[in-house]
């Protein structure tokens, strides 16, 4: 459910939202770290209806969700958490 992407592409997000998205609507979360052509960290939420939302990394809810997912990743998360590098 949580993915970290390292990419040489420029920024993917044109507009960011801080609107809370309930866990039941989230398919996966992409984290695009700062650097490599984009000066800011980006978080992309893929919703189960196939739509994509760029989330403000400063939004309290997404920070909390990522922390919970990280904590659960070693034991009880029903959907695997994984990191993937994209060249």
């Amino acid at each position: 459910v949580l993915e970290v992407y390292y990419t040489s592409l420029r920024c993917r997000c044109v507009q960011e939202s801080s609107v809370f998205i309930p866990r039941r609507f989230i398919d996966r979360i992409q984290i695009l770290p700062r650097g490599n052509g984009c000066p800011r960290k980006e978080i992309i939420v893929w919703k189960k209806n196939k739509s994509i939302v760029c989330v403000d990394p400063q939004a309290e809810w997404i920070q909390r969700m990522m922390e919970v997912l990280r904590k659960r990743s070693s034991s009880t998360l029903p959907v695997p958490v994984f990191k993937r590098k994209i060249p």
Epitope: V19, F20, R23, R24, K48, N49, R64
Partner: antibody
């Protein structure tokens, strides 16, 4: 003005069936997740089921999923709840509610409710 | 299922009082909690969503706070028209669940 109007409630014997309807007006019905919520006499609120705009994703309260079926007809701006094998404990006011992404998928508009009484 | 433990189940307060209702959740629901007001014979009305966002048209005396497992709903100055039952609800994951309700009465 948003309006949700439930109908189809009434008195039914245990083991019987009912189909509730919710007619929506004043909204682009095909955009919204919709839910059914019920309230037994003198009791609290109990979520029954929800359905996404395309009817491709449906969730139920675990204790009800074998007997209740939620559906919708976007062309008719209508939401339905088929209730089978009814029991006395299903006696309640049944509300339909819209879930809006503006309010983060909470139930921001509710109908006035329709009463279902299961009794012999 | 996620359990919502709401307290108190009833309370009596005077006009102008500050009223606080709490909701404890059995597991982390982030900020996925809403608060509803229901008057006798009427459908519930959404007051607060995402723990602290006031819904359109809701008076500023109503507020909410919290995240994770502990949530609070406050009426800063109780008005006669606030007499109702208030419910918390988690919408983070299914099945959606409600608290047992808090019946608010005027002293």
């Amino acid at each position: 003005e948003v309006q949700l109007v439930e109908s189809g409630g009434g008195l039914v014997q245990p083991g019987g069936s009912l189909r509730l309807s919710c007619a929506a007006s004043g909204i682009d019905f095909s955009r919204y997740w919709m839910s059914w919520v019920r309230q037994a006499p003198g009791k609290g609120l109990e979520w029954v089921a929800e359905i996404n705009p395309e009817a491709s994703s449906i969730n139920y309260a675990p204790s009800l999923k074998d007997r209740f079926t939620i559906s919708r007809d976007n062309a008719k701006n209508s939401l339905y709840l088929q209730m089978n094998s009814l029991r006395a404990e299903d006696t309640a006011v049944y509300y339909c509610a819209r879930q809006d992404d503006y309010s983060h998928y909470t139930m921001d508009y509710w109908g006035q409710g329709t009463t279902v009484t299961v009794s012999s | 299922d996620i359990q919502m433990t709401q307290s108190p189940s009833s309370l009596s307060a005077s006009v102008g009082d500050r009223v606080t209702i709490t909701c404890k959740v059995s597991q982390d629901v982030n900020t996925g909690v809403a608060w509803y007001q229901q008057k006798p014979g009427k459908a519930p009305k959404l007051l607060i969503y995402s723990a602290s966002y006031r819904y359109t048209g809701v008076p500023s005396r109503f507020s909410g706070s919290g995240s994770g497992t502990d949530f609070t709903f406050t009426i800063s100055s109780l008005q006669p028209e606030d007499i109702a039952t208030y419910y918390c609800q988690q919408y983070y994951s299914t099945p959606l669940t409600f608290g047992g309700g808090t019946k608010l009465e005027i002293k």
